[in-house]
C-alpha cells in the first residue's frame, strides 16, 4: 500500500517533468548534479538528489509562475513510508556531488528516466514471466 | 506535440509474419516506453506489449511466443513483428506512447490488418 | 489476468447532461487506472490516469475517482465533442488490460 502510494506520485511527477521540459527556456542554465545508470537498491539516494537540486526559474516572461508552481511539486517529499529503507542505502550509493552534472534539459531527461525505471520496476515486481529482455 | 504514424501491409496470409512499424514525429523515441495495441473488429482494446528505449520488453503473455518489438532510435521508429498469424488477428493495430509507464499519452490513428488468403 | 468490466457498454444522454461510467477491476489495483476516448478512425485520447489525474491539456469537465476495485468516470456537463467510446485500463501488473468500451451517444 505505501509502496503504491510511492508510485502513484512518481507517475504524477513524469507529468510535472514533461511539463518542466516545456519550459527549459525559461529555467537558470546552471549545471546540476543528475544521476544516470543508476545502480538498483541506490533509486531513492539518486531520487533525493534530484530532488535536492536548485532548479531555478530564470524570473523572465510569464511563464515564473508555472515555472515555480511546478518545481516545488517536484520537491514535495514523497510520503514517509519506506524512508528507513531508503536512509540504509544511502549509506553505500554515491553522494549527489558525485554524480556527473547537466544543464536543465538532460537534468529533466534523467528525472523522468528515473522515474520511469522505479515505477516499471513496481510493476514487473507484480508480475511473473513479463519481463523479455 | 508528439506523433505517431503506423505503416505497414493491409493485408497478411494465415501462417505468415505481421510486420508493421511505427514512425515517431514531434518528439525522441530514445526516452519514454513505445508500445503496440490491437482491436479486433467489433471487440474491446488488447495490450500487445511495449518497449522502453533501452530496448527491454513486456508482451502479453496471450501473445508472447509470437511477438516481436524493436526499436531503431537513428530511424525514430519501432516496430511489431507477429508470426503464425490467422484471422483472430485481424484487427486495427494502434501504436502508442507511454511516458509514464502504466497508460499511453499518444496514439497513432491505427491501421487495419486483415489475415486472409 | 485482471479483467476489467465497464457499464453500462452503451449511454444515450443529450448537451449539457452529467455522465458517469463505471469500472470494476476483477481484483483490487490500488488506483492504477487510466480513461481514454476514442472516436471513429481517430487516435484514442488519454484523459485521466492514475484513477484522478487529469491529463494535460483535458477539459476540467472531466474527473475521475475510485481505488481499489471500483472506479468512475464523470463528464460533468456533456459538450458535442464528447460523443464517443471510452475505455478503462488498468496498469497493477502485466498484461496491461482494457475494459470492453461504453459509448456515449447522443439521445
Known amino acids: 500500500q505505501g509502496q503504491d502510494r510511492h508510485m502513484i506520485r512518481m507517475r504524477q511527477l513524469i507529468d510535472i517533468v514533461d511539463q518542466l521540459k516545456n519550459y527549459v527556456n525559461d529555467l537558470v542554465p546552471e549545471f546540476l548534479p543528475a544521476p544516470e545508470d543508476v545502480e538498483t537498491n541506490c533509486e531513492w539516494s539518486a531520487f533525493s538528489c534530484f530532488q535536492k537540486a536548485q532548479l531555478k526559474s530564470a524570473n523572465t516572461g510569464n511563464n515564473e509562475r508555472i515555472i515555480n508552481v511546478s518545481i516545488k511539486k517536484l520537491k514535495r517529499k514523497p510520503p514517509s513510508t519506506n524512508a528507513g529503507r531508503r536512509q540504509k542505502h544511502r549509506l553505500t550509493c554515491p553522494s549527489c556531488d558525485s554524480y556527473e552534472k547537466k544543464p536543465p534539459k538532460e537534468f529533466l531527461e534523467r528525472f523522468k528516466s528515473l522515474l520511469q525505471k522505479m515505477i516499471h520496476q513496481h510493476l514487473s515486481s507484480r508480475t511473473h514471466g513479463s519481463e523479455d529482455s | 506535440q508528439v506523433q505517431l504514424q503506423e505503416s505497414g501491409p493491409g493485408l497478411v496470409k494465415p501462417s505468415e509474419t505481421l510486420s508493421l512499424t511505427c514512425t515517431v514525429s514531434g518528439g525522441s523515441i530514445s526516452s519514454d516506453f513505445w508500445g503496440w495495441i490491437r482491436q479486433p473488429p467489433g471487440k474491446g482494446l488488447e495490450w500487445i506489449g511495449y518497449?522502453?528505449?533501452?530496448?527491454?520488453?513486456n508482451y502479453n503473455p496471450s501473445l508472447k511466443r509470437r511477438v516481436t518489438i524493436s526499436v531503431d532510435t537513428s530511424r525514430n521508429q519501432f516496430s511489431l513483428k507477429l508470426s503464425s498469424v490467422t484471422a483472430a488477428d485481424t484487427a486495427v493495430y494502434y501504436c502508442a506512447r507511454s511516458a509514464g509507464v502504466t497508460d499511453f499519452d499518444f496514439w497513432g490513428q491505427g491501421t487495419l490488418v486483415t489475415v486472409s488468403s | 489476468d485482471i479483467q476489467m468490466t465497464q457499464s453500462p457498454s452503451s449511454v444515450s444522454a443529450s448537451v449539457g447532461d452529467r455522465v458517469t461510467i463505471t469500472c470494476r477491476a476483477s481484483?483490487?489495483?490500488?488506483?492504477?487506472l487510466a480513461w481514454y476516448q476514442h472516436k471513429p478512425g481517430k487516435a484514442p485520447k488519454l484523459l485521466i490516469y492514475?484513477?484522478?489525474s487529469l491529463q494535460s491539456g483535458v477539459p476540467s469537465r472531466f474527473s475521475g475517482s475510485g481505488s481499489g476495485t471500483d472506479f468512475t468516470l464523470t463528464i460533468s456537463s456533456l459538450q458535442p465533442e464528447d460523443f464517443a467510446t471510452y475505455y478503462c485500463?488498468?496498469?497493477?501488473?502485466?498484461?496491461?488490460?482494457f475494459g470492453g468500451g461504453t459509448k456515449v451517444e447522443i439521445k
Open positions: 492514475v484513477a484522478s
Open positions: 518497449i522502453s528505449s533501452s530496448g527491454s520488453t
Open positions: 481484483q483490487g489495483i490500488s488506483s492504477w
Open positions: 485500463q488498468q496498469a497493477n501488473s502485466f498484461p496491461l488490460t
